[in-house]
Interface confidence: low
């Protein structure tokens, strides 16, 4: 693995894709989504230590300033780098419709 | 302001653009950047309470699951929605060069 992908905090502790099983009720969607009734939500969770999956120059700056001023500048944060589309069957005024959401499930993660 | 822009935690506490004054030494750039010698770094700092500047559907999901499982799922995080370009004068083996970085200074912020 590249240096930027090796977690210095130990396996699984750094920013990576996690799957969280959720019902429509958990998501607050029960009143407008018909299907699926359960979703395997992929999201980005974990710490962002120095040089780990840095998204860009801004992330590098943020980490350097965080080390200097930890009370002022937070560490970079683990967020989606891209998303997988997902189709929901939704209720509409006239019936139901299929709607594709491009920004619902995280596909991979980085630190910003 | 839209509901998503009104901070329920009080003025200035939620996710927004901050400016942090930093030297080349602070940024760790002293050995490869000639100019500017100081940078007004704009970055995204602040809390992401429910419905505040939610970037997308994923952010909504994350907040709902964070409320249900706060030990497992972190709250959404304040990150750049877009960036401003910045030109650096860099040292090279043969002299100096101008380099534009598109991902260095945050332009506006949202919660993901």
């Amino acid at each position: 693995a590249r240096n930027g992908d090796r977690c210095p905090l130990g396996p699984g502790r750094c920013c990576r894709l996690h799957t969280v099983h959720a019902s429509l009720e958990d998501l607050g969607w029960a009143d407008w989504v018909l299907s699926p009734r359960e979703v395997q939500v992929t999201m980005c969770i974990g710490a962002c230590p120095s040089q780990f999956r840095e998204a860009n120059m801004h992330a590098q700056i943020k980490m350097n300033l965080h080390r200097l001023k930890p009370d002022t500048v937070p560490a970079p944060c683990c967020v989606p780098a891209s998303y997988n589309p997902m189709v929901l069957i939704q209720k509409t005024d006239t019936g139901v419709s299929l709607q594709t959401y491009d920004d619902l499930l995280a596909k991979d993660c980085h630190c910003v | 302001a839209r509901n998503g822009d009104r901070c329920p935690l009080g003025p200035g506490r939620c996710c927004r653009l901050h400016t942090v004054h930093a030297s080349l030494e602070d940024l760790g750039w002293a050995d490869w950047v000639l100019s500017p010698r100081e940078v007004q770094v704009t970055m995204c700092i602040g809390a992401c309470p429910s419905q505040f500047r939610e970037a997308n559907m994923h952010a909504q999901i994350k907040m709902n699951l964070h409320r249900l499982k706060p030990d497992t799922v972190p709250a959404p995080c304040c990150v750049p929605a877009s960036y401003n370009p910045m030109v650096l004068i860099q040292k090279t083996d043969t002299g100096v060069s101008l380099q534009t970085y598109d991902d260095l200074l945050a332009k506006d912020c949202h919660c993901v």
Partner: antibody, heavy 119, light 111 residues
Framework: DVKLVESGEGLVKPGGSLKLSCAAS????????MSWVRQTPEKRLEWVAY????????YYADTVKGRFTISRDNARNTLYLQMSSLKSEDTAMYYC????????????WGQGTTLTVSS | DSVLTQSPASLLVSLGQRATISCRAS??????????MHWYQQKPGQPPKLLIK???YLESGVPARFSGSGSGTDFTLNIHPVEEEDAATYYC?????????FGGGTKLEIK
């Protein structure tokens, strides 16, 4: 336009094997669950197998469990049904269908491909 | 498994009249909010075509003379007024849980 085109039809002896394919186009194949549904000569419709969009959830009708294998290649936009230990009661028209998710409906069907199992 | 029983097996209806097809499930295919029952139309030499989803929601492009109702174990497909092009076999199908099953079909003829 959504298009599902089945292929692989054949006449097979009892105990034999056959693989059906379904080429999908006109939609983002990797976002949709898919199923195979068959129609017997008596015109009864039978759901055969289901595969989720990513291929991680698979379900079979009891009548084919252990003999049929559903799979997909999202890079090739293709759905497959590998059939083995075939019986005369497997004789049917096999339809490739788009199923969306586990509790949805079949919103698109292919034209079907015929399997005849006979000695 | 939920067994779906359709009745009648065949139906002869005059042009412009109402056709009513019943589908009974051996156990509930509904939740507190939705019924996972769908209806299809099949004409000779063609694959089935989705008409109604979740018991009562008309699929896009399907004429408004088709309607569906019911919950729990009893569901109905109505066609009114019947037109010549509606001559076909109609199937119900549930997706409440696996295995998904279909009804035996109802053949509608127009006189």
């Amino acid at each position: 336009d959504v298009k599902l085109v089945e292929s692989g039809e054949g006449l097979v002896k009892p105990g034999g094997s056959l693989k059906l394919s379904c080429a999908a186009s006109g939609f983002t194949f990797s976002s949709y669950a898919m199923s195979w549904v068959r129609q017997t000569p008596e015109k009864r419709l039978e759901w055969v197998a289901y595969i989720s969009s990513g291929g991680d959830n698979i379900y079979y009708a009891d009548t084919v469990k252990g003999r049929f294998t559903i799979s997909r290649d999202n890079a090739r936009n293709t759905l497959y049904l590998q059939m083995s230990s075939l019986k005369s009661e497997d004789t049917a028209m096999y339809y490739c269908t788009r199923a969306l998710v586990e509790n949805a409906y079949f919103d698109y069907w292919g034209q079907g491909t015929t399997l005849t199992v006979s000695s | 498994d939920s067994v779906l029983t359709q009745s009648p097996a065949s139906l002869l209806v005059s042009l412009g009249q109402r056709a009513t097809i019943s589908c009974r499930a051996s156990k509930s295919v509904s939740t507190s909010t939705y019924s996972y029952m769908h209806w299809y139309q099949q004409k000779p030499g063609q694959p089935p075509k989705l008409l109604i989803k979740y018991a009562s929601y008309l699929e896009s492009g399907v004429p408004a003379r088709f309607s569906g109702s019911g919950s729990g174990t009893d569901f109905t497909l109505n066609i009114h007024p019947v037109e010549e092009e509606d001559a076909a076999t109609y199937y119900c199908q549930h997706s409440r849980e696996f295995p998904w099953t279909f009804g035996g079909g109802t053949k509608l003829e127009i006189k």
